[in-house]
């Protein structure tokens, strides 16, 4: 029950996180015009990863896309790449995790397969979250650097009679959305990895201690109080569950008490 809840919660948290990463990537407000100690403009500038916008005092908003690819700063390209990689990995992770959910039964999929899929999706979510956090952090660092550079240049002009208005930019809403979303995806991934441990069928709960008796060997398994001879047809490992011991065949044939919520 706890495993299913952890897995389900991990999936939901990751889903919200990835939706947030997608939203942040598409948002225009990655950087917004700093209104403090700045020349008061009749327009409000803000920029995203894909276009820059201006909102006039009337409320009229106009955006222009970055139609060049080679002319863009390398850092911006890197942030775009990190966010896209994060989205792609997250989307694949979501797809994998849907099939890995314990509450969804697909044919005769073994618990070990579900455990592997849960682990895979968990790792994907973790990497996806890290990509988003890294992307947003790189952009934030770029903003901080540019902010102080433009502050230094604000009142110096351009050397001649004509001055250029230095519009300083500060953190936009998309950065906070990205950080939170990346964090949620990361947490969701960790939860999936934790759930994977609970899903994985352990070989034995305790290490078997073998006593070599004359004629045949008997492996005494304390805790389960089950003994298995070293001969005969029953050579499969016994797995000790809360509900008693079953062979692997039995595990597949009969649903355990953990299979349904």
């Amino acid at each position: 029950m706890a495993v299913t809840a952890c897995q389900g919660l991990g999936f939901v948290v990751s889903l919200i996180g990835i939706a947030g990463i997608i939203a942040a990537t598409c948002m225009d407000q990655w950087s917004t015009q700093d209104l403090y100690n700045n020349p008061v403009t009749a327009v409000f500038n803000y920029q995203g990863l894909w276009r820059s916008c201006v909102r006039e005092s009337s409320g009229f908003t106009e955006c222009r896309g970055y139609f060049t690819l080679l002319g863009l700063p390398a850092m911006l390209q890197a942030v775009r790449a990190l966010m896209i990689v994060g989205i792609v990995l997250g989307a694949i992770g979501l797809l994998v995790s849907i099939f890995a959910l314990k509450c969804i039964r697909i044919g005769s999929m073994e618990d070990s397969a579900k455990a592997n899929m849960t682990l895979t999706s968990g790792i994907m979510f973790i990497v996806s979250g890290l990509c988003a956090i890294a992307g947003v952090s790189v952009f934030a660092n770029m903003l901080v650097t540019n902010f102080w550079m433009s502050t230094a240049n604000m009142y110096t002009g351009m050397g001649g009679m004509v001055q250029t208005v230095q519009t300083r930019y500060t953190f936009g809403a998309a950065l906070f959305v990205g950080w939170v979303a990346g964090g949620l995806t990361l947490i969701g991934g960790v939860m999936m990895c934790i759930a994977c441990r609970g899903l994985a069928p352990e070989e034995t709960n305790y290490k078997a201690v073998s006593y070599h008796a004359s004629g045949h060997s008997v492996a005494y398994k304390p805790g389960g109080f089950k003994a298995s001879t070293g001969f005969g047809s029953n050579t499969k490992n016994k797995k000790i569950y809360d509900g008693g011991a079953r062979t692997e065949d039995e595990v597949q044939s009969y649903p355990s008490k953990h299979d349904y919520v």
Epitope: T41, A42, N45, C53, V54, E56, S57, F60, E62
Partner: antibody, heavy 119, light 113 residues
Framework: EVQLVESGGGLVQPGGSLRLSCAVS????????MHWVRQAPGKGLEWVAY????????YYADSVKGRFTVSRDNAKNSLYLQMNSLRAEDTAVYYC????????????WGQGTLVTVSS | DIVMTQSPDSLAVSLGERVTMNCKSS????????????LTWYQQKPGQPPKLLIY???TRESGVPDRFSGSGSGTDFTLTISSVQAEDVAVYYC?????????FGQGTKLEIK
Amino acid sequence: EVQLVESGGGLVQPGGSLRLSCAVSGFTFSSFGMHWVRQAPGKGLEWVAYISSGTTNIYYADSVKGRFTVSRDNAKNSLYLQMNSLRAEDTAVYYCVRSGYYGSSLDYWGQGTLVTVSS
Amino acid sequence: DIVMTQSPDSLAVSLGERVTMNCKSSQSLFSSGNQRNYLTWYQQKPGQPPKLLIYWASTRESGVPDRFSGSGSGTDFTLTISSVQAEDVAVYYCQNVYIYPLTFGQGTKLEIK
């Protein structure tokens, strides 16, 4: 038809006060920012003040800062300019102007009201 | 504050003639966000309030004859009247509508010879 009608102008002594009003019709007043612009007799245009549609942003020319106060009553479709500590150089025709939707332009102007500051 | 300087102060032209007047700002009026210049041109005929002619430095206001055109970017702007008509006699003002306080040029007076 967009109409802006200024009133409240007249003769006032230096140091005195005056309140100008602008009655607006023909458009949704509460959706537009408004300006006051003045023109001294025989001189050029001088921007005086701006108030945004929701009164969140208010700006003044340096020459009137601290003496003039712009306000608006969206329910009454009215714009106001409270002028205190008037000086001779404040003598001008005062225009009430709508801030345009595009380009931050000043698109509709009233006919103006004359304010004369003299002893 | 941004200083707007217009030239010439006045000019007299013949009917049908092409006329250009200039406006220079002390700071750039170009907004990188939408690649537009926040400069406006007005026409003020004697005894009348000003009338909006051009915004964004080059976009004609609706109802303005197409003989009026604006150009320029950054700090240097031009208003052109391709073929002057008698009704074009007026004072023409440029205005910075980018940075507060908004500032006007001193005006260019157009007369007919």
